[in-house]
């Protein structure tokens, strides 16, 4: 693994990265839990969403999102003008016109109502660190990802390789 | 240009360990996930190891977890597979292979080494 | 573990043949599908991967489509350099899983 210079090196050039396409590669309808197995939920409330972090009573429906898959060009660190590899980019949607948003100046995320062309602060960098669990690093604050705060959803800096597997920053996503 | 060189295959008796490695270069190695996988002599492809980007996870099938062990040295851009107590139905070309997309499993392997033949038997 | 049913084991094309291989998954998964050719005393190479999108440098004679259980490779128009080993794959689950494999062959 690699230390905090690494993490910076492999995020610094998120910023430069495109977007190849304006369609997705694929979509995939999920629900969306924590490490923990706490169901990611989506309310309205005064005509705007709500997002919590909770225990689901048993048989209770889990919500479902939406997410839709980009492939986004990522510039050589070495040339500067090859392309050194593909990320995978993600938008995430629990409902039409609604989509997750990072605001880090409030370190938070939101849902908004929004047209396409998306904004930037709706696209989050696709991470495996397990097998079977993912991470959603924010395209406009490399080294930020979603993470749950308090029952909430939030945005976490991480600023080492070792805090890439923190459990709070680690998502499950199934069809059930 | 993206280049994955194993080595280290050979003629080893059952029982015995070999240490497999492959050099990588032309990307980024520590963005990406690695991955092993085999072909017995005219058969099919077979999984065998994969290691997370940060090397924090390792996943094996039932068929060789316990005796392979797969790891990685980001500082030399190799990945490594360490085979123990050898068996004859371990005989195969093992290929190293990288994914697809930076710190990510999907989209299956389109950078594949020129493989290493191991032979396991007495 | 995904069980990933190959057809047909074997085929025989003449050139310029449209042929189709497919894919049956024991269960249902997301497109993460991939498909490879592979010829004789070399490496698997990419052709297909999310199941439909084609890898960079692959002729676009080659195409898959399919989701859930049912999977398709298609070559619209053999060539002589189609002749090979061709195989499937899921990355949705773990274990990961490979098809049995089809052998192309011209008539």
């Known amino acids: 693994a690699f230390g905090i210079s690494g993490v910076q090196k492999y995020t610094r050039a998120l910023h430069d990265s495109s977007i190849t396409g304006i369609s997705p590669i694929t979509e995939y309808l999920a629900s969306l839990s924590t490490y923990n197995d706490q169901s990611i939920t989506f309310a309205l409330e005064d005509e705007s969403y709500e997002i919590y972090v909770e225990d689901l009573k048993k048989d209770e429906k889990k919500d479902k999102v939406l997410l839709s898959y980009y492939e986004s060009q990522h510039p050589s660190n070495e040339s500067g003008d090859g392309v050194d590899g593909k990320m995978l980019m993600v938008t995430l949607s629990p409902t039409k016109d609604f989509w997750l948003h990072a605001n880090n100046k409030e370190h938070s995320v939101e849902l908004h109502k929004c047209e396409k062309p998306l904004p930037d602060q709706a696209f989050f960098v696709l991470h495996n660190m397990h097998s079977n669990c993912v991470s959603f690093e924010c395209k406009t604050d490399p080294g930020v990802f979603i993470g749950v705060k308090d029952n909430h959803l939030a945005l976490i800096k991480v600023d080492s390789s070792e805090n890439l597997c923190t459990e709070n920053i680690l998502f499950k996503l199934s069809e059930t | 240009e993206v280049q994955l060189v194993e080595s280290g295959g050979g003629l080893v008796q059952p029982g015995t360990s070999l240490k497999l490695s492959c050099l990588a270069s032309?990307?980024?190695?520590?963005?990406?996930?690695m991955t092993w996988i085999r072909q017995a002599p005219g058969k099919g492809l077979e999984w065998i190891a994969s290691?997370?980007?940060?090397?924090?996870?390792?996943y094996y099938p039932d068929s060789v977890k316990g005796r392979f062990t797969i790891s990685r040295d980001d500082a030399k851009s190799t990945l490594y597979l360490q085979m123990n107590s050898l068996r004859s139905e371990d005989t195969a070309t093992y290929y190293c292979?990288?994914?697809?997309?930076?710190?990510?499993?999907?989209?299956?392997?389109?950078?594949w080494g020129q493989g290493t033949l191991v032979t396991v038997s007495s | 573990d995904i069980q990933m049913t190959q057809s047909p084991a074997s085929l025989s094309a003449s050139l310029g043949e449209t042929v189709s291989i497919e894919c049956l998954a024991s269960?249902?998964?997301?497109?993460?599908l991939a498909w490879y050719q592979q010829k004789s005393g070399k490496s698997p190479q990419l052709l297909i991967y999310?199941?439909?999108r084609l890898q960079d440098g692959v002729p676009s004679r080659f195409s898959g489509s399919g989701s859930g259980t049912r999977f398709s490779l298609k070559i619209s128009g053999m060539q002589p350099e189609d002749e090979a080993d061709y195989f499937c794959?899921?990355?949705?689950?773990?274990?990961?899983?490979f098809g049995s494999g089809t052998k192309l062959e011209i008539k």
């Open positions: 794959q899921q990355g949705s689950k773990y274990p990961l899983t």
């Open positions: 290691i997370t980007y940060t090397g924090g996870g390792t």
């Open positions: 032309g990307f980024t190695f520590n963005n990406y996930w």
């Open positions: 999310a199941a439909s």
């Open positions: 292979t990288r994914a697809n997309y930076y710190y990510n499993t999907y989209g299956g392997f389109p950078y």
């Open positions: 269960e249902g998964f997301s497109n993460d």
